[in-house]
Interface confidence: medium
């Protein structure tokens, strides 16, 4: 029987040009972690391998990085980064568990406002 | 120790098919996760595909550039795993290697890389 639970940083937002950190957390369960999958629709991002470590897919090493602990850091975002992030838990003996995250990236405020607090 | 052995590399024309193998063998050997890995002449190794024990059963992982011509496979009675490789191109030309962790001893082992040339 599957008792755990996934708590996942849920819906967020980061400036274009920033980074974020895609946090999530399986409580509630004794059962072993054996891989997280991080996706992004249907595109494979990374893997952490509980033993054969992480794993960035070749178009995102150079915006996306390990870390910290299950978490992924994404980097240099752009408006395109926008939208659902899953991580995938793959435990034993449980099963598959899933969270969501919800990423929005908007506009710089520096770039959108920055006129406006010109010092005269 | 576990020793890997992989096998099935070669020559093969563009649209052909491979099938790699990579036997483990070592005193009470029983597999938590394996995974195959690839290496192009002057650039980083990088992750293929991985299977991993997931609740009763197992699950697997694609990298995206692979996702649907090759399948990642282990027969668990021979401590041995497989990869198909159907529809082969040439930006798969590598070197392919095999690890595999030990349950016992959490920690992976390396084969010695089969070496796989898509060419005309």
């Known amino acids: 029987m599957m008792t755990g639970t996934i708590e996942t940083t849920g819906n967020i937002s980061a400036e274009k040009g920033g980074s974020i950190i895609l946090q999530c957390h399986l409580s509630s369960t004794t059962a072993q972690v054996t891989q997280v999958n991080w996706e992004q629709q249907d595109q494979l991002l990374a893997i952490c391998n509980a033993d054969l470590g992480w794993h960035i897919s070749p178009s995102f090493k150079d915006r996306v990085a390990p870390g910290p602990g299950l978490g992924l850091t994404l980097q240099s975002l752009t408006v395109n980064d926008t939208g659902e992030y899953f991580c995938i838990y793959h435990t034993y003996p449980d099963g598959t568990y899933t969270g969501r995250i919800f990423l929005e990236v908007l506009e710089s405020s520096v770039a959108e406002h920055g006129a406006r607090f010109q010092i005269p | 120790e576990v020793q890997l052995v992989e096998s099935g590399g070669g020559l093969v024309q563009p649209g052909g098919s491979l099938r790699l193998s990579c036997a483990a063998s070592?005193?009470?050997?029983?597999?938590?996760?394996m995974g195959w890995f690839r290496q192009a002449p002057g650039k980083e190794r990088e992750f293929v595909a991985v299977i991993t024990r997931s609740g009763g059963g197992e699950v697997t992982t694609y990298a995206d550039s692979v996702k649907g011509r090759f399948t990642i496979s282990a027969d668990n009675s021979k401590n041995t795993a497989y990869l198909q490789m159907n529809s082969l191109k040439p930006e798969d030309t590598a070197v392919y290697y095999c690890?595999?962790?030990?349950?016992?001893?959490?920690?992976?082992?390396w084969g010695q890389g089969t070496l796989v040339t898509v060419s005309s």
């Open positions: 690890a595999m962790s030990s349950v016992t001893r959490g920690s992976s082992d």
């Open positions: 070592g005193r009470n050997f029983r597999r938590n996760s």
